[in-house]
Structure formats: C-alpha cells, structure tokens
Interface confidence: low
C-alpha cells in the first residue's frame, strides 16, 4: 500500500482511461493512467502496477518519481524526455522493474536529477553511455549526488561475454559526469574484484557501499584520492587480509569509517600487519567482532586478541612435495 | 494517525554513551527517511541526522560525524540513535521525525515531542 | 556545506500585522526550502515545504515564496497563537540544514 502523508492528497487515474488520451495531447499535469499523483507533494507513483513503460504524460510538477515493482523491461534514450522537460524531477526509483537495458542517454534532459535508484534490476545491459548520455571523452557533468545499484547482477545465463564488473564501471567512468557523485552503493553484485581507476574518478565519493560482493582483495584499489569518503562498507565480502599499502591508505584518509564483517579473515604470518593496524586504529567500525576463518586452528579467534606467536605461516614445501 | 514517540533521554557524563530511540506508529515506517533534530538551550534548531527508509543511507551533521550513529528497526517500526563520546553542548531536546519525499527535495512533516539529553559531569 | 541565514533574528509585532521573514541561502537551492513553526515547549511544526506549497491544515494567512537564494516567509495578518520563533531549512543539499531562527514577539 503507498504511503500517505498529510502533506499529499493523492489522486489516482483509473485504468480505463489510458485509451481514451493516448490518441490526444496530455492535459497539463494530469495523472498518469494507473498511477497515484500528488501535485502538493510534487510525487508520483506508480508502484507494482507491471507497467511496461515510462508513463509519458508525467505531471511537469513531479519531484519525486516512484516506478518502482514493474516490467520495463528497457529504458530507452530520453526515457524521460519531455516537452516541456521535467526539470524540477530530483529523485528516480526504478528498483524491482525487470530492467534488463538501459541505453545511453536514459536520463538526459533532467538537470536535477540527484538520486537514482536501479536496484534489483537484472542489468544485463548497461550503456556506458547510460549516465553521461553521450560519448564524449568528457561529458557536461551529471547532477547525480546519489546512484543505488545494489543488486543489478542478472543471472549469470543472462550475463554478456564480458566482465560485469567492467560493465558497470564503464558507465562510472564514462566523460567524467559522475564528478559529484557523493554516495554510490553497488551491494550485492557478486563483484570478484574492483577495477582499480574507478575510484580515482569518483573524487567527491562520502559513501561507498560495496557489501556482499564475493571481493577477494583490495590490493590493486586505490583510496588515496578519496579524500572526501566517510563510509566504506566491505562486509560480507571475501577478503582474506589487508595489506600495508591498503592500511596505510585507509589511515590517511580524514574522515572514513570502514566496516569489515563477514569476511574468512586467514589468520597466518601475512596478517600480522593488518593486527597491529587494527589494534590501533579507530577508523574500524566493529572491530572487536572481526574473526579468522582459516586455517582451522585459528577459526573464531578474535583478530584483536591475536599476538605475532599466534601468526604463522607453514613452510613452503619443495615444488616436488606440492599439491594443487 | 501518524505518531512519533522518543525516549532514551537523561543525564550523562561527558564522554558517555545514549541511545535514543523513536518508536513511530501510524503509517508504513519503511517506506519513509527518518532523521534526527535537536535544540539546545537557547540555541535555535539544529538537523543532526538522518537515514533513508530502508536504512542502506545514512547522513551526518559534521558536528556529530563519528559519534553518533543513526539506524533504524523497520520490523519494529523503530528509530534509534547512538551517541558516544559526548560533550556538553551535545545537551539538548532531541526530536525524531518524519520525511515526506525523495531525501533532496523532503520536507519534516511529522515531529515527536522530543526527549532531553544533559551531558554534565 | 549551504549555510541559511535567516534576517531578522528577532522581530516585535503587533496582531493584525503583515510580517516578512527572509531566508537566504550561500548558493543556489532551487525551491528546495521549508519553513517550521516552533513555539516553547512544542514540537516544530510545518508550515511551508517547497518554498511556497501550504501544508495541509496551516492557516492561509501563512505564505511562502523565493527560488534560488532568495526565500520569503509572510503573514498576512498576524494572529495572536502566531508568537513564535520561525525556521527555515534547506533539502537540496546533501546535509540539511536550519536557518538560525527569526523570534517573533508581540510588541
């Protein structure tokens, strides 16, 4: 059921005129066929309605965009292209509405789009032209403070011949537009690794979500630039140890707070400078509950309580004594 | 009928621990930003925090930023936050209320009664 | 971060006054901009969200205009429950911030 508020008086357009205007121009800010509208809280909404999709005679009015539970499938060039423009459109939710495409140019002509949200769309196809809206090298810059990606991954049958990870970054990095992006969360997209130029163009980063990916080390990623960044979320992931040049990048940072839960911590000589690190430093959230998963005699050890005695790693065996 | 109710309030040292909470009741709690407002004595009034309906954004004033701590209990319709190292002009009412809109184009329509919190040694 | 300024910081009416209360903003916030009503010992309450829209159940001799840097909060003629300290807020940028608040007081 849609939230209401006192501040909104929704008004819904009942199905049975969707035929009835379609053949005619839109009057001036009226209701989308099954959509609710609220011209006072500037919102629309067109929630689980298996619209197939955008709405065209969206309300000049609307700020807030809800197209959230449907089946559209694509989103086109100037999907949201209107005359005259929605200009005043600040946050777009998308999520759960079986995109499967987005093309380059999907969200031109909206100067004050801020907030996106694509989560749990399976993105097979991703323009890298999807946010900058064209290609070149160097794009007037986006108004996006906001981009929400988690879970975008499509089934891995519905997966290109190419590196999802790559895809995505492509539509990152793309003319630069993303210069202003400040929260940008790519949770849950079985990420194995992170191409390590994505963050030195992403400088005015605060947030950065990339939990639940299947990350298995940090060690060709670069912090330095993100001088900005108060929050990197790396839990559920798959690290097994930070290394110094990591650590030290983390700690120059001013303002960072780092989770790390859930991750198979391998407790053996290679550890010991991420111990001593995080017995002194203050930019781990939830440090006291970071444990080792491997080797098996170290497993639930808390890393903090660890001592360079416990850390140890076994001798390499002679190549002719090795297994695979 | 929209509700907002705060409690965890109460007197605390300097450099102590809080957790407020809000329990809100009245409407689909998930599907709204939450954030946190103070006043201080005197003072006039100060956004302190807030967090988005499904909880995955959170955002800072930067006289708070690495002491408190904003979540939220969608099941059980709860508002919380943790305040750590306090310090005497953290003392204020503190009020919890209600977003109507995308976080950048939102406005508070629904306010608690607030709940007081003194730090003083 | 945007800074509100609020002008004046404190103002003596008398009822049956227009009072105008102004807000200006470090940079451009669009019409991103509430006003709140906040009287001793009550919650704030809303009045004004995106810059001139009346929220539901406020009296219409309350009024809000301005876009950009520039915002306008009136009262066309002052009522006596009317007393009271006025807030304005930005939502455009990533932190939401207050105006320092105008006092309105009877003369």
């Known amino acids: 059921s849609s939230p209401t508020s006192s501040a909104s008086s929704f008004s819904s357009s009942a199905p049975f005129l969707a035929s009835a205007v379609s053949a005619q121009p839109p009057l001036p800010d009226q209701c989308p066929a099954l959509c609710e509208c609220s011209e006072a809280a500037r919102t629309v909404k067109c929630v689980n309605r298996n619209l197939t999709e955008v709405p065209t005679d969206l309300p000049a009015y609307v700020r807030n965009l809800f197209l959230t539970g449907n089946q559209l499938a694509v989103l086109p060039a100037g999907a949201f292209a209107r005359r005259p423009p929605l200009a005043e459109l600040a946050a777009l939710n998308l999520s759960g509405s079986r995109l499967d495409e987005v093309r380059a140019g999907a969200f031109e002509h909206l100067p004050s789009l801020r907030q996106l949200d694509l989560s749990h769309n399976p993105l097979a196809d991703l323009s890298p032209f999807a946010f900058s809206g064209s290609n070149a090298s160097v794009s007037a810059p986006s108004p996006l403070v906001e981009l929400i990606l988690n879970h975008i991954v499509p089934p891995e049958d519905e997966r290109q011949n190419r590196s999802f990870e790559g895809m995505v970054v492509a539509a990152l990095l793309a003319g630069r537009a993303l210069q202003g992006l400040r929260r940008l969360e790519l949770a849950s997209n079985h990420f194995l690794y992170l191409p390590r130029d994505v963050l030195a163009q992403l400088p005015s980063l605060r947030h950065l979500d990339l939990s639940n990916n299947s990350l298995v080390s940090l060690t060709y990623v670069s912090f330095r630039n993100l001088t900005h960044l108060e929050s990197l979320h790396l839990e559920d992931n798959a690290l097994k140890v930070l290394h110094n040049g990591t650590l030290a990048e983390l700690q120059g940072l001013p303002h960072i707070r780092v989770f790390l839960d859930n991750n198979p911590w391998v407790c053996d000589c290679h550890m010991a400078d991420m111990v001593t690190w995080l017995k002194e430093t203050e930019v781990v959230q939830g440090k006291d509950r970071l444990t080792c998963a491997y080797p098996e005699k170290m497993r639930n050890r808390v890393l903090l309580e660890l001592n360079s005695a416990d850390l140890d790693c076994d001798p390499i065996l002679p190549p002719s004594l090795q297994t695979s | 009928e929209v509700q907002l109710l705060e409690s965890g309030g109460g007197l605390v040292q300097p450099g102590g621990s809080l957790r407020l909470s809000c329990a809100a009741s009245?409407?689909?709690?998930?599907?709204?930003?939450m954030s946190w407002v103070r006043e201080a004595p005197g003072k006039g009034l100060e956004w302190v925090s807030a967090?988005?309906?499904?909880?995955?954004?959170?955002y800072y004033a930067d006289s708070v930023k690495g002491r408190f701590t904003i979540s939220r209990d969608n099941s059980k319709n709860t508002l919380y936050l943790q305040m750590n190292s306090l310090r005497a002009e953290d003392t204020a009412v503190y009020y919890c209320?209600?977003?109507?809109?995308?976080?950048?184009?939102?406005?508070?329509?629904?306010w608690g009664q607030g709940t007081l919190v003194t730090v003083s040694s | 971060d945007i800074q509100m300024t609020q002008s004046p910081s404190s103002l003596s009416a008398s009822v049956g006054d227009r009072v105008t209360i102004t807000c200006r903003a470090s940079?451009?916030?669009?019409?991103?901009l509430n006003w709140y009503q906040r009287k001793p010992g009550k919650a704030p309450k809303l009045l004004i969200y995106a810059a001139s829209s009346l929220q539901s159940g406020v009296p219409s001799r309350f009024s809000g205009s301005g876009s950009g840097t520039d915002f306008t909060l009136t009262i066309s003629s002052l009522q006596p429950e009317d007393f009271a300290t006025y807030y304005c807020?930005?939502?455009?940028?990533?932190?939401?911030?207050f105006g320092q608040g105008t006092k309105l007081e009877i003369k």
């Open positions: 967090i988005s309906g499904s909880g995955g954004s959170e």
């Open positions: 209320a209600r977003y109507y809109g995308g976080y950048y184009s939102a406005w508070m329509d629904y």
């Open positions: 940079q451009s916030i669009s019409s991103y």
């Open positions: 009245g409407f689909t709690f998930s599907s709204y930003a």
């Open positions: 807020q930005q939502t455009y940028g990533y932190l939401h911030t």
